[in-house]
């Protein structure tokens, strides 16, 4: 079996963590977030070939069925396996508040 | 905001649970599973338009960035939110064994 972390599609094409630079405007947050003004958003992007970072048995099944009928069953998808928390300074009716979000920035990725 | 469960793309086109009929051969299990001979595999298939079954804040961010740069950031992806367990009767060196798998059949779906 192939090493689950070696990408057969070529450098950088398989499921991995990417960083995308975004402003509050880009994120649609300008009206309710004060800070940070810009965010390094970490997200999971890339293809999920056979055996690559398979999250579970379901991903394995999905890949096998995708190979049989790809117009019906899509390939597994690159999604966060876990998240890093992030603190936002938000506008409130009375002023500002600090809020921690646990599901905002991807920490690592797998294929489901 | 749109209702998170109303599909704007037309009936059945958005992220939802599908059942795919599969044999042990289809799944690549013929050499190690005895029963069941056929499986009704439940999996998550369909598009993830804006606000549809968004799993978390990350999905919301991903959708916003996808709209800004679709060639860089893919749309959120339809994946299992939870799983149903399934028992397989497996071949072993000494005979057979019953094994429960908790991550095999999707129970419900969301967009990440």
């Amino acid at each position: 079996a192939r090493n689950g972390d070696r990408c057969p599609l070529g450098p950088g094409r398989c499921c991995r963590l990417h960083t995308v630079h975004a402003s509050l405007e880009d994120l649609g947050w300008a009206d309710w977030v004060l800070s940070p003004r810009e965010v390094q958003v970490t997200m999971c992007i890339g293809a999920c070939p056979s055996q690559f970072r398979e999250a579970n048995m379901h991903a394995q099944i999905k890949m096998n069925l995708h190979r049989l009928k790809p117009d019906t069953v899509p390939a597994p998808c690159c999604v966060p396996a876990s998240y890093n928390p992030m603190v936002l300074i938000q506008k409130t009716d009375t002023g500002v508040s600090l809020q921690t979000y646990d599901d905002l920035l991807a920490k690592d990725c797998h294929c489901v | 905001a749109r209702n998170g469960d109303r599909c704007p793309l037309g009936p059945g086109r958005c992220c939802r649970l599908h059942t795919v009929h599969a044999s042990l051969e289809d799944l690549g299990w013929a050499d190690w599973v005895l029963s069941p001979r056929e499986v009704q595999v439940t999996m998550c298939i369909g598009a993830c338009p804006s606000q549809f079954r968004e799993a978390n804040m990350h999905a919301q961010i991903k959708m916003n960035l996808h709209r800004l740069k679709p060639d860089t950031v893919p749309a959120p992806c339809c994946v299992p939110a939870s799983y149903n367990p399934m028992v397989l009767i497996q071949k072993t060196d000494t005979g057979v064994s019953l094994q429960t798998y908790d991550d095999l059949l999707a129970k419900d779906c969301h967009c990440v």
Epitope: P8, L9, P49, R67, L68, D71 | -
Partner: antibody
Framework: QVQLQQPGAELVRPGTSVKLSCKAS????????MHWVKQRPRQGLEWIGL????????NYNQNFKGKATLTVDTSSSTAYMQLGSLTSEDSAVYYC??????????????WGQGTSVTVSS | QIVLSQSPAILSASPGEKVTMTCRAS?????MHWYQQKPGSSPKPWIY???NLASGVPARFSGSGSGTSYSLIISRVEAEDAAAYYC?????????FGGGTKLEIK
């Protein structure tokens, strides 16, 4: 640019076997699935099977199980199809065609020029 | 396996005419793909996923359909369109092709 090179023709005897080649260039060989398709004279297209060069996974049309065997040599970016126990029914043009399994739904996007196999004594 | 039936088998048209060829599936499929093949050449992808034109295909071509019925349409046929056109599905295993429609230009 992507190219799939196949030899033009093969003349073979009944009962023997033949190994057809398809040399790929212009892309990462392990990133595309490789299909093989049969076309008999003045007839339509018939899918034989596919191989995923990334892990040697194969699946075959039931009609060709036992007839065709698909393999790859990743070091030379070449796909092969061996056809066994040849009869006149196997006389046809055989195409290899690459397919991006990770951009579905898609078509078989690049095709070789085809190898014409003639089975004759 | 899913059987794809193409009609008509042979289609004769004059330059400038609108042409429609159909592909019917024995069971419902999610998408249809189309290939063009000229004599002595290999098939070329022409339309993928029902309605998307492959690279380099003229805009006079279009594709449509759903379920069991799909069509390839040429709004104004030209001499260079003379060829065989094959439909193909891969919603179900194994992938299958239609028998083809041969387009002749008068």
């Amino acid at each position: 640019q992507v190219q799939l090179q196949q030899p033009g023709a093969e003349l073979v005897r009944p009962g023997t076997s033949v190994k057809l080649s398809c040399k790929a260039s212009g892309y990462t060989f392990t990133s595309y699935w490789m299909h093989w398709v049969k076309q008999r004279p003045r007839q339509g297209l018939e899918w034989i099977g596919l191989i995923d060069p990334s892990d040697n996974y194969t699946n075959y049309n039931q009609n060709f199980k036992g007839k065709a065997t698909l393999t790859v040599d990743t070091s030379s970016s070449t796909a092969y199809m061996q056809l066994g126990s040849l009869t006149s029914e196997d006389s046809a043009v055989y195409y290899c065609a690459s397919y991006d399994g990770y951009s579905t739904p898609s078509a078989m996007d690049y095709w070789g020029q085809g190898t014409s196999v003639t089975v004759s004594s | 396996q899913i059987v794809l039936s193409q009609s008509p088998a042979i289609l004769s048209a004059s330059p400038g005419e609108k042409v429609t060829m159909t592909c019917r599936a024995s069971s419902s499929v999610n998408y249809m793909h189309w290939y063009q093949q000229k004599p002595g050449s290999s098939p070329k992808p022409w339309i993928y996923a029902t309605s998307n034109l492959a690279s380099g295909v003229p805009a006079r071509f279009s594709g449509s359909g759903s379920g069991t019925s799909y069509s390839l349409i040429i709004s104004r046929v030209e001499a260079e369109d003379a060829a065989a056109y094959y439909c193909q599905q891969w919603s179900s295993y194994p992938p299958t092709f239609g028998g083809g429609t041969k387009l002749e230009i008068k």
